[in-house]
């Protein structure tokens, strides 16, 4: 049972009748295979559902797919398979939905062997109508929309050609051959890597990075000896092979590849990798894999240029095999990230940062929970969160942690309470303050989703048996009501609600199984009558984010400013509504040394906030010194943390040093140093 189900909870009046009047069943009259669901546009109510069914015949596989459309958030569906001429749609490409509210959809069809190219179905009116287009190539990837112009599409062909369309897939032009990876940048720029000799695999580390800013009319080679590249925020990253050995290093550009700087990060060998964990316009979190098959590495955080990096977290779990990491951006509170570390005894522990990677700590033990068997001390332990890694290990974890930007402070996750992640059946925990404090919300594993910007939380028990009950809470998970949405239980497969957590509709997907057949079925529940009135001023209360000590003058200051939010009172049962905008009021804090990171050539001694000059430069610091650009080697030792808005207070002004003088090494002759390239 859920905490709160047995307590004196303010039950929502007549909720069974209200929900019963707003529960809509739809049975799909085709055999159960796989189903994929996509929302088309924002606040349009349009959902596309593609069901596919494979029948293995003697020599080949016979496939059948059906396309359904809803325009009322899933309450009713219409079979629109005839709009795509009953063609079998390739599910591995999914449904390519256009950005923003463009209303564009591209479906990639299966075509018979020997055909000249593939086939797509295009819609630009929210899937009311489709146009069939035969392609002059066989697509290898899903069509990619330009973020700036949804008429511009790019795709890679099975023969490694880069194809571009300027009229939403009507006409296609091959703009380059021998392409390994292509990505849209800003301003309709395309970045791509090409191989000269054999293939993408054979030329790994010898690829060239190209850029076109005019959809293929002209090109510029912006990098050579490329292993791979990535885009994050305003940064373009490339891992580049070293001249002398098989190692590679990260180079960074903030001007679309015109100029590059070497990043002050360790180089990696053939078996290692770099990974951009998160990036915005201010900074980047970079994972650097440890040598050997350790399953962990180090997180580094960048300065505002993406060049100087501070070590943020050691022994960061990131498996080489499955490429799984638990790194999670808590989108409901600025500066908060959660991830896992692999401790010396090989147990996995959860860590959280509230200041964008400056400091990491364990999660506080929930007040209403006991320490489990993994805890040495039964009174002292932490909450450990199950995320991607646990899911990949097939633990009983149906969902990753959940947070939404418009449900301020709310984080929901599966977890266990002890000294490390436990393989026991997890419970569901909630934080209403962005991860500072936690409460057990539901007993056992559940699927969960946030509706109406946090006004309602919905959950369904994860069970191997058929289910017919949904739970919901109107007070951020403290009290729970249960509603039986059907007399006949279904095998549950998923919860679907419109992305953005503004909707009040939830769709429960599953299938019914009888002696001979099994069919897809969905139940869509509209909670609008539970939240029967619009929220007013009196329904909100003021909350200071990141508050830990009210007696501290700078309480709540993170990255140089504090933010107060209007939060819905837990007792208010009302609609935030689709147009709800988070009301927040920032106030600038005074600067302290904590608002600055140590620039290149400087470090912070343990338990000291001052940046001290490194006596000698070693390892990758020395390499950066030797091969970095000269203007990055002149510093006063401090740089403002990216995104930090503090003013006044401490201003660490001191003598500017030219670190070029320290760029000396026993391995290099003076001539080599003088001729170093910038």
């Amino acid at each position: 049972s859920a905490p709160g189900e047995d307590e004196e909870c303010g039950a929502v009046r007549d909720f069974v009748a209200k929900l019963a009047n707003n529960t809509h069943q739809h049975v799909f009259d085709d055999l159960r295979g796989s189903v994929s669901l996509s929302w088309v546009g924002d606040s349009t109510g349009v959902i596309l559902v593609l069901t596919t069914f494979h029948v293995p015949l003697v020599i080949m596989t016979f496939g059948q797919s059906k396309l359904y459309r809803s325009e009322d958030y899933g309450k009713n569906f219409k079979d629109i398979t005839d709009l795509i001429n009953n063609t079998f749609i390739r599910t591995e490409f999914g449904m390519a939905i256009g950005p923003e509210n463009s209303g564009k959809v591209v479906l990639t069809a299966e075509v018979s062997g020997g055909s000249r190219g593939g086939r797509i179905f295009r819609s630009s009116d929210f899937a009311k109508n489709f146009v069939q287009t035969d392609l002059p190539f066989h697509p290898l990837t899903q069509m990619m929309y330009s973020p700036q112009n949804s008429d511009y599409l790019l795709a890679l062909s099975t023969e490694n050609g880069l194809w571009v369309s300027k009229n939403f897939g009507g006409k296609w032009e091959e703009i380059h051959k021998a392409v390994c990876l292509a990505k849209w940048g800003s301003d309709n720029t395309i970045f791509f890597t090409t191989y000269a000799n054999g293939s993408c695999k054979a030329d790994l580390g010898a690829l060239e990075l190209w850029r076109t800013s005019d959809l293929g009319k002209s090109f510029k080679t912006i990098g050579v000896k490329i292993y791979s590249f990535g885009l994050g925020g305003r940064f373009l990253f490339a891992s580049v092979m070293a001249d002398k050995d098989t190692t590679r290093r990260i180079h960074v550009s903030t001007d679309q590849g015109d100029t590059w700087s070497m990043a002050q990060l360790p180089s990696v060998g053939q078996e290692q990798f770099y990974s951009i964990l998160a990036a915005n316009d201010d900074m980047v979190f970079m994972h650097v894999d440890e040598p050997g098959d350790t399953g962990f590495g180090t997180i580094f955080t960048s300065d505002d240029r993406g060049i100087v990096y501070s070590k943020s977290l050691d022994r960061h779990l990131y498996t080489t095999t499955g490429g799984e990491t638990d790194f999670t951006n808590v989108t409901s509170l600025r500066g908060v990230y959660i991830t896992s570390v692999l401790s010396e005894d090989n147990s996995i522990q959860t860590m959280i940062t509230f200041d964008q990677g400056g400091r990491w700590t364990h999660l506080r033990k929930p007040e209403n929970s006991e320490c489990d068997a993994t805890a040495k001390n039964k009174n002292e332990c932490s909450l450990h969160i199950h995320a991607s890694y646990s899911i990949s290990q097939k633990l009983n974890v149906p969902m990753a942690p959940l947070s939404e930007p418009n449900a301020v402070g709310i984080v929901i996750a599966h977890g266990s309470v002890g000294d490390a992640i436990s393989v026991m059946v997890p419970d569901v925990y909630i934080s209403d303050d962005g991860g500072y404090s936690w409460t057990k919300m539901l007993e056992g594993p559940h699927y969960y989703t946030i509706l109406d910007s946090g006004g309602i939380i919905v959950a369904i028990e994860h069970s191997s048996r058929p289910i017919n009950v949904i739970k919901f809470s109107t007070d951020e998970g403290q009290c729970w009501q249960t509603y039986t949405f059907t007399r006949d239980p279904i095998y549950f497969t998923g919860l679907a609600s419109e992305p953005g957590a503004r909707s009040m509709n939830i769709s429960i997907w599953g299938f019914t199984e009888s002696f001979l057949t099994s069919q897809w079925v969905s139940y869509t529940i509209d909670f609008k009558d539970i939240l029967e009135r619009n929220c007013e001023e009196k329904d909100y209360t003021i909350w200071l984010a990141h508050s830990t000590d009210p007696e501290d003058y700078e309480d709540g200051c993170i990255l140089g400013y504090k933010e107060q939010f209007l939060r819905l009172r837990k007792s208010s049962v009302c609609q935030n509504g689709r147009d709800y905008v988070v009301t927040k009021q920032p106030s600038i804090c005074l600067c302290s040394l904590e608002d600055f990171l140590c620039d290149f050539g400087y470090y912070r001694p343990e338990n000291d906030s001052k940046c001290v000059e490194q006596p000698e430069l070693k390892g990758h610091d020395l390499e950066f010194c030797l091969y970095g650009r000269e203007e990055h080697l002149t510093t006063n030792g401090y740089r403002k943390i990216p995104g930090d808005k503090c003013q006044g207070g401490v201003n660490p002004v001191r003598e500017v040093k030219d670190l070029k003088k320290k760029c000396t090494s026993n391995f290099l002759s003076p001539e080599k140093q003088n001729s170093k390239s910038n």
Epitope: Y436, T541, I542, S547, P550, Y553, D555, S571, S587
Partner: antibody, heavy 124, light 106 residues
Amino acid sequence: QVQLVQSGAEVKKPGSSVKVSCKASGGTFRNYAISWVRQAPGQGLEWMGGIIPIGGWANYAQKFQGRVTITADESTSTAYMELSSLRSEDTAVYYCARQGRKTGYYYYYGMDVWGQGTTVTVSS
Amino acid sequence: DIQMTQSPSTLSASVGDRVTITCRASQSISSWLAWYQQKPGKAPKLLIYKASSLESGVPSRFSGSGSGTEFTLTISSLQPDDFATYYCQQADGHITFGGGTKVEIK
């Protein structure tokens, strides 16, 4: 130790306004909400409204909306409550109180420090 | 606004008695309830916050319980200094107080 010191007693005519001050000392004034509570002779406690000094966010009880204005001056660590259109029923002791705070919520933890009270008498 | 109903309004008890005062909210307020003690001519004093947390410096004979809509304040063994008026206050809506319970000598 935090202290709240209120201004002295007032005698006012009906229809006029009164402004009561509440000065904080010995604590971090800006990080706590200040509430104003009144108590008519022989009656119970009645919350009028509150303010958070950072940002000056004020909120008022429905009953006093439009008639009460609560402000705060961070530089002097002083909160003010002004009540207009006074009537005889407004005769009461007016208290300012600091809202205790354990988390980011300003109003959820009770009022842990109180002023000594200011008697306001409304009489023609 | 949320209404708070306190009972009884007056309670006669002797030193050493166990005293219980109840407070009912017109809708669920979770645990956001405080209890105060007030003596004539003095400002109220916070005893309990968040329904059951004892304010520092308050004797342990005072305890609070409840959540949702029903709450109680208990004085396990009444002392001479405890004869006063007690108020509950909810904090999950615009703040409202209960009508008060006067604990007097029997």
